[in-house]
């Protein structure tokens, strides 16, 4: 009382930091700093982030909240998790689509667009790896189909004459009836 020396940050508990004259307790996640504390080891005046803004971490200095990102509809993105006061919108791809990064060194914050997953069934192939972070990995042809060029061709139902070697190996059993 009545002194002129600003106190050191030797406040009880953690999360105090010098803001101007005094050591202040910071604001919790989801809140921004309206005004610093007015006395040693005091609480800063913190307000909840307005709608469509957020702050993910406790902080001493943010006087405004960050704007929530909007998912890029042009890139076929959808919101997997809506923005809250403590977390940004999490954008991703809807089921049946996968993330295609727009940069070579891909990290979580990299720009991306969504691509439809390959439908292995429509290609008459086994699904080897389901589509999620990358495109579907299709395997060998389904039963009743054989490899021909890049695709799977349906086994013939008539004579073996029109059935090449690979076809015969896969489809030969059909001709026993």
């Amino acid at each position: 009382q009545g002194g002129t020396r600003s106190p050191r940050c030797d406040c009880a508990g953690d999360f105090h930091k010098k803001i101007g004259l005094f050591c202040c307790r910071g604001c919790p996640a989801g809140h921004y700093l309206k005004a610093p504390c007015t006395e040693p080891c005091g609480n800063s005046t913190c307000l909840v982030c307005p709608q469509d803004t957020f702050l993910a971490w406790e902080n001493h200095h943010n006087s405004e909240c960050a704007r929530c990102q909007a998912c890029d509809e042009q890139a076929s993105q959808v919101a997997l998790e809506n923005c809250s006061a403590v977390a940004d919108t999490r954008c991703g791809c809807k089921p049946g689509w996968f993330v295609e990064c727009q940069v070579s060194q891909c990290v979580s914050s990299s720009p991306f667009y969504c691509q439809p997953c390959l439908d292995c069934g429509a290609l008459h192939r086994h699904t080897r790896l389901l589509c999620s972070r990358r495109d579907t990995d299709c395997g060998t042809c389904l039963p009743g189909f054989y490899e021909h060029g890049d695709g799977c061709v349906s086994c013939p139902t008539s004579t073996l004459g029109s059935c090449p070697e690979r076809c015969a190996a896969v489809c030969g059993w059909r001709q026993m009836f």
């Epitope: 600003s6 101007g20 004259l21 005094f22 005004a35 504390c37 007015t38 006395e39 005046t45």
Partner: antibody, heavy 116, light 107 residues
Framework: EVQLVESGGGSVQPGGSLRLSCAAS????????MSWVRQAPGKGLEWISY????????YYADSVKGQFTISRDNAKNSLYLQMNSLRAEDTAVYYC?????????WGQGTLVTVSS | DIVMTQSPSSLSASVGDRVTITCQAS??????LSWYQQKPGKAPKLLIS???NLETGVPSRFSGSGSGTDFTFTISSLQPEDIATYYC?????????FGQGTRLEIK
């Protein structure tokens, strides 16, 4: 609109006393630290005292310690400066200012003249 | 106490000129520095806080920079209404202290 209006200034003889008031409006007074800053005629600005938002912490410049007392009444949105044993060198315009360090709003000032 | 040394104490410049005022603290004050404008017979007005943060409503021709002990205040293009005395002020430590002021005049 934030407003700070000082009153209580005037002429006083050396050794006399005055009580300055600062009426605050347009903001939540009880959330802010407040200061008194003075300016002698033709001179620069001198911070003299600070009080925390609750009134629980007060600080003074060495030049006025033991002579001036800062106080506040949050119910009345008012800040005060009790000035005793006034000397000629206390002649100045006295401003109340809002903030805990950086002063974003100031009153218009009240002139205190100490002269025999 | 932290001593704030402002220079120059006065300066004369023409409309449109770039004007620079410096402020030096006697010890490290981080970025806890404000700049004020005071016109004759009026209360000071806060222009810049935290060394470089322009207050709402203050024209963008005013700017501040610096950290530690050396700070600069700049008016990029002097206007007639900028004629005033300018003060720096530290709030890193009590007692709060001001520079002695810089009186700005038009040539």
């Amino acid at each position: 609109e934030v407003q700070l209006v000082e009153s209580g200034g005037g002429s006083v003889q050396p050794g006399g006393s005055l009580r300055l008031s600062c009426a605050a409006s347009g903001f939540t007074f009880s959330s802010y630290g407040m200061s008194w800053v003075r300016q002698a005629p033709g001179k620069g600005l001198e911070w003299i005292s600070y009080i925390s938002s609750s009134g629980g912490h007060t600080y003074y410049a060495d030049s006025v310690k033991g002579q001036f007392t800062i106080s506040r009444d949050n119910a009345k949105n008012s800040l005060y400066l009790q000035m005793n044993s006034l000397r000629a060198e206390d002649t100045a315009v006295y401003y109340c200012a809002r903030g805990s360090g950086s002063f974003d709003y100031w009153g218009q000032g009240t002139l205190v003249t100490v002269s025999s | 106490d932290i001593v704030m040394t402002q220079s120059p104490s006065s300066l004369s410049a023409s409309v449109g000129d770039r004007v620079t005022i410096t402020c030096q603290a006697s010890q490290d004050i981080s970025n806890y520095l404000s700049w004020y404008q005071q016109k004759p017979g009026k209360a000071p007005k806060l222009l810049i806080s935290d060394a470089s943060n322009l207050e709402t409503g203050v024209p963008s021709r005013f700017s501040g920079s610096g950290s530690g002990t050396d700070f600069t205040f700049t008016i990029s293009s002097l206007q007639p209404e900028d004629i005033a005395t300018y003060y720096c002020q530290q709030y890193d430590n009590l007692p709060i202290t001001f520079g002695q002021g810089t009186r700005l005049e038009i040539k």
